[in-house]
Interface confidence: low
Amino acid sequence: RDSPEDFVYQFKGMCYFTNGTERVRLVSRSIYNREEIVRFDSDVGEFRAVTLLGLPAAEYWNSQKDILERKRAAVDRVCRHNYQLELRTTLQRRVEPTVTISPSRTEALNHHNLLVCSVTDFYPAQIKVRWFRNDQEETAGVVSTPLIRNGDWTFQILVMLEMTPQRGDVYTCHVEHPSLQSPITVEWRAQSESAQSK
Amino acid sequence: EDIVADHVASYGVNLYQSYGPSGQYTHEFDGDEQFYVDLGRKETVWCLPVLRQFRFDPQFALTNIAVLKHNLNSLIKRSNSTAATNEVPEVTVFSKSPVTLGQPNILICLVDNIFPPVVNITWLSNGHSVTEGVSETSFLSKSDHSFFKISYLTLLPSAEESYDCKVEHWGLDKPLLKHWEPEIPAPMSELTE
């Protein structure tokens, strides 16, 4: 099927932060369609052509001392500068997860089932979700979705446990997250009608 | 190569394309959109309320986009008019929270691997177009230099309604519909041995 012709140019000014601002790296990328053609890497200190298409630009920009000096200063003037702003805002953002458990099928004792622990609406991304059966951690039969980015500054993740419920069994989904003073634990009891948060 | 770091920011992502022609200017932090500049209205639109305390001069974005336009024209000539290759987008639909009938929720349609960044995302309810309660992100950048975009539909889940996220893109032979309907939790019954 014929589609319109399109030509795309991208420029990405990227800052990489490790251990606060102890290690900061600026990489500015010029991209034609999806091909990166020129890069300025603060670890290198000058423009480098990534492909032949970017050679004239790299040579020209390196010849312009004002452009080069501005780029060399950008790791401080852009990256570190903006990181101070992030420290006041995004890096302090904490949204507590909501945790619920649901079985994937109608429960029946001694019948194979899947318990789904839905951990939703949290920020930042790092999270630890574990399953326990009668206070013993379950590692076999645990399947997790990747971390899901909602695109609205929240994340979610679903962690499934394959199980065969026995009468009296207590299954616990245990969630640790930077927004929480102490972990969230939600219980699901074989024969009970609902999951309960402790 | 992907650079390993605790945090990655894009200050900013500048995009200009001949189709339209159109441009986009955003800042991203750890993969989320901080703001975009509405290039037509010449205003900065913040995507996270806490960031509204700060200022970003939209003129900076407009100047950058003008430079990109100039650079693109040079590259089209230099590349003997090598146009963008259409990629096949991947579409996933899921809810923001676990579904309870009658409880407000949000459907999320993730359109991944978008290139070039021209796409039409719409929502259907029982086959009919829905326009109310619909919003979407800007084109969000990826390390392979393709994009993704997320569309949202606020809804009140009911057993009678099913939904489709409809995606139109040049990489698709025909519009792609991803279906979603509420999974009504299995009724709780007395357990029998």
């Epitope: 601002t21 401080d76 500068h81 903006n82 101070q84 | 509204r52 305390q53 700060f54 001069d57």
Partner: antibody
Framework: QSLEESGGDLVKPGASLTLTCTAS?????????MCWVRQAPGKGLEWIAC????????TYYPSWAKGRFTISKTSSTTVTLQMTSLTAADTATYFC??????????????WGPGTLVTVSS | DIVMTQTPSSVSAAVGGTVTIKCQAS??????LAWYQQKPGQPPKLLIY???DLASGVPSRFSGSGSGTEFTLAISGVQCDDAATYYC??????????????FGGGTKVEIK
């Protein structure tokens, strides 16, 4: 755009006092950080407190000022500084200052003329 | 808290000469430094921000440099009107909602 401080006075040790900063030519509907800085006679500048005038109303103090000084936004054009348990060491000219907006780093780019507080028995 | 150490505490310069004032932060503040000029009976006036950017309306004979912990204010072609006390001011965010906004002790500049 200007700032003016008021409320400076001669007070006895142990007393409380409230200073007011009034903005002219702009209002806090555009959010700013508003601050108080003081200067003892013949001495240097000392930051006391700041408040973000947006909806969060976040306040910031150096460790020495916490508890005894309270900054508040009282209207769309006024910010106050409440001071308690005053001592002779608090004798100073108190400046109201607006922070330069829109930068990752913050500086004071608009100052009031100052108001004198004297603590003496 | 961050300490800003300013040197010298006073300096005398001839008209047309150059004055250099140094400011040292007790830990890195990157480019988070400003310089102010204060004349007797007046509030301070912002001269330089982000370590080296000139505030609007400030003559180009004033310049700032440095980053991290060491900063310098230079006044070249000193004029009589430059007689004043100059302060450096560091801005650092210490995490968990704590800011360190600290001034140096000041440098009094006299013109001969």
């Amino acid at each position: 755009q200007s700032l003016e401080e008021s409320g400076g006075d001669l007070v006895k040790p142990g007393a409380s006092l409230t200073l007011t900063c009034t903005a002219s030519g702009f209002s806090f509907s555009s959010s700013y950080y508003m601050c108080w800085v003081r200067q003892a006679p013949g001495k240097g500048l000392e930051w006391i407190a700041c408040i973000y005038t947006g909806s969060s109303g976040s306040t910031y103090y150096p460790s020495w000022a916490k508890g005894r000084f309270t900054i508040s936004k009282t209207s769309s054009t006024t910010v106050t500084l409440q001071m308690t348990s005053l001592t002779a060491a608090d004798t100073a000219t108190y400046f109201c200052a607006r922070v330069r907006a829109g930068s990752g780093y913050y500086y004071f780019n608009l100052w009031g003329p100052g108001t004198l507080v004297t603590v003496s028995s | 808290d961050i300490v800003m150490t300013q040197t010298p505490s006073s300096v005398s310069a001839a008209v047309g000469g150059t004055v250099t004032i140094k400011c040292q932060a007790s830990q890195t503040i990157y480019s988070g430094l400003a310089w102010y000029q204060q004349k007797p009976g007046q509030p301070p006036k912002l001269l330089i921000y982000d370590a080296s950017d000139l505030a609007s309306g400030v003559p180009s004979r004033f310049s700032g440099s440095g980053s991290g912990t060491e900063f310098t204010l230079a006044i070249s072609g000193v004029q009589c009107d430059d007689a004043a006390t100059y302060y450096c001011h560091g801005d650092y965010y210490g995490g968990s909602g704590t800011f360190f906004w600290t001034f140096g002790g000041g440098t009094k500049v006299e013109i001969k």
